[in-house]
Interface confidence: low
């Protein structure tokens, strides 16, 4: 999936299986990513688990779990708030669109999380105070905290190179980046560009991610995924000058 | 160098109206161990910082004064001055305790927010 880190780095990651997205003293978010097509290096998020840790007089430990075709508006224990403590309402789940869009407010840690199902896959967005982001017990053992450190270099796909290549040669795929033998070859570059431009008029990294996804999968739902990801940035990012990213830094994670 | 953050966390863990860790309790040692851990985490960026080196020596002195072992539990991390779980004196304040921005505004203007997102393939 495409990852925008807490430090505004933008990466396309081929991480497969279960990976920690956030892991601090208050919250743990794990995603499970699966290949979008057989033989493809590109992966998308098929499962999301969020653990809100027991916190003082505010909330009991709560676990939220979403999977493909199952976006519940409740924690796994059936509740919609933080439990029985005095400040239980400082953690709340709100269903915005049934089965498609859920918002979790964790006021006790100043955090808002948006989870969506777009097409078959899940998207995740969070707004969190720096103090909470950095509240980790052991920096050394939490080296794979994706939102903070980014993806390991060997798990990154250079989708801008893919984009440049595709621009020059139609829908020919970069095998090294993301071979997708079963993707519909009939999806031309021009169509991908048109579809993405429709939803994402600014040619930023969200637009480029959209084009990459369409060429890789032939699934137009990924246009909406990029569109909603940008909408969530507009709602959640505190710096309105940084809504659109144009350069992807591919430096070492950390 | 984030030594001032370590100092303030230790201060808030060992002082204040609910005093979770008075000098003669195991909690005080736990708070000291947390303080030591905090200084170790920030060590790389604090070389030559006077406040850092005095904190490190101060911790060693306090550890030996109070017979604290180096290994053992650390105090539970807290956000700002939020009290420890189960502190009954603070129960009536729970709506504010459980509202990060309200408790933050007591200390500084507004928290710095960050964003992370994951989408697509």
């Amino acid at each position: 999936p495409h990852l925008r880190t807490f430090t505004d780095r933008f990466q396309t990651c081929k991480v497969q299986g279960a990976w920690p997205l956030i892991d601090n003293n208050y919250l743990n978010v794990q995603v499970t990513n699966t290949p979008v097509l057989p033989g493809s290096a590109a992966t998308a998020t098929s499962k999301l688990t969020i653990i809100f840790k027991n916190f003082q007089e505010c909330v009991d430990q709560k676990v939220y779990q979403a999977e493909m075709d199952e976006l519940p508006a409740a924690f796994v224990d059936g509740s919609k708030n933080g439990g029985d403590k005095h400040g239980a309402n400082s953690l709340k789940i709100t269903e915005k669109v049934s089965g498609q869009h859920v918002e979790i407010q964790a006021k006790y840690i100043g955090t808002t999380i948006v989870v969506r199902q777009v097409g078959r896959y899940l998207t995740f967005a969070v707004r969190m105070p720096e103090e909470v982001v950095n509240a980790v017990e052991d920096w050394d053992s939490q080296g794979l905290y994706l939102c903070l450190r980014g993806c390991p270099l060997n798990q990154q796909i250079d989708f801008q190179a893919f984009h440049t290549n595709a621009e020059g040669t139609g829908a020919r795929r970069l095998a090294a980046a993301s071979p997708a033998p079963t993707a519909p070859e009939t999806f031309p570059y021009e169509t991908a560009v048109a579809k993405c431009k429709e939803k994402l008029p600014v040619e930023d990294l969200y637009y480029q991610a959209c084009v990459f996804d369409l060429l890789t999968t032939g699934d137009v739902n990924f246009t909406l995924a990029a569109y909603y990801a940008l909408e969530d940035v507009k709602m959640l990012h505190s710096n309105k000058d940084k809504l659109h990213l144009y350069e992807r830094t591919r430096d070492l994670p950390g | 160098c984030k030594i001032l953050k370590c100092n303030s966390e230790f201060w808030s863990a060992t002082s204040g109206s609910h005093a979770p860790a008075s000098d003669d309790t195991p909690e005080f040692c736990a708070a000291l161990r947390s303080y030591a851990l905090c200084t170790r985490r920030t060590a790389r960026t604090c070389r030559g910082d006077l406040a850092y080196h005095s904190a490190v020596h101060g911790i060693e002195d306090l550890m030996s004064q109070h017979n604290c072992s180096k290994d053992g539990p650390t105090s539970q991390p807290r956000l700002r001055t939020l009290p420890p779980a189960g502190d009954s004196q603070e129960r009536s304040d729970s709506p504010e305790i459980c509202h990060y921005e309200k408790s933050f505004h007591k200390h500084s203007a507004t928290p710095n927010y960050t964003h992370c997102g994951l989408f697509g393939d």
Partner: antibody, heavy 120, light 109 residues
């Protein structure tokens, strides 16, 4: 003290069912999952599945799907594991364990185990 | 789904260090932060020794430590003691099933 206390040993015939109970105390029963793990004589540990006592959500090991049923009774803080169509290879000690922080994570408290013998 | 692979047995003298490996796939070990280790004495229930690869529950001596490299997680017991003689199991999660390793018998010579 957090404790899980299991029911006593059982002897069953092949084809029968067995229901093992696990009574929790010392913590809020609905705030943790319960996993079931079995261990055949002289063998290793074998995960059977998980249940959320609050919602009844379950996640069973693929090889036991259709034969295992996990339930809970929140009024008595008790979890149950029922295994049907028993065969001799189901002879094992069955453990319940509290799950530390979510369905698939670490098991921090274990019951004492219940020996189930399947023999004709 | 195959279990995680552990050596059948390891041994060491008191005071020595021993390391038990637990090898799986990228999804069961390599990409997972949720690897835990359990100690089991004969006739007893297992006991949690490490969780989330490296973390020690309270009450577990600090001579027990965990690490991970690639698709292999490891448990190290430094300063081996007589009471450490037991079976040790690793556990992780892959796909939809929780997996245990086959177990390693640690013998204190």
């Amino acid at each position: 003290e957090v404790q899980l206390v299991q029911s006593g040993a059982e002897v069953k015939k092949p084809g029968a069912s067995v229901k093992v109970s696990c009574k929790a105390s010392g913590y809020t029963f609905t705030s943790h999952g319960i996993s079931w793990v079995r261990q055949a004589p002289g063998q290793g540990l074998d995960w059977m599945g998980w249940i959320s006592p609050y919602s009844g959500n379950t996640n069973y090991a693929q090889k036991l799907q259709g034969r295992v049923t996990m339930t809970t009774d929140t009024s008595t803080s008790t979890a149950y594991m029922e295994l049907s169509s028993l065969r001799s290879e189901d002879t094992a000690v069955y453990y319940c364990a509290r799950v530390g922080s979510g369905p698939y994570y670490y098991m921090d408290v274990w019951g004492q185990g219940t020996l189930v013998t399947v023999s004709s | 789904q195959s279990a995680l692979t552990q050596p059948r047995s390891v041994s060491g003298s008191p005071g020595q260090s021993v390391t038990i490996s637990c090898t799986g796939t990228s999804s069961s070990v390599g990409d997972s932060i949720y690897v835990s280790w359990y100690q089991q004495h004969p006739g007893k229930a297992p006991k949690l020794m490490l969780y989330d690869v490296t973390k020690r529950p309270s009450g577990v001596p600090d001579r027990f430590s965990g690490s991970k490299s690639g698709n292999t997680a490891s448990l190290t017991i430094s300063g081996l003691q007589a009471e450490d003689e037991a079976d040790y199991y690793c556990k992780s999660y892959a796909g939809t099933d929780t997996l245990f390793g086959g177990g390693t018998k640690v013998t204190v010579l």
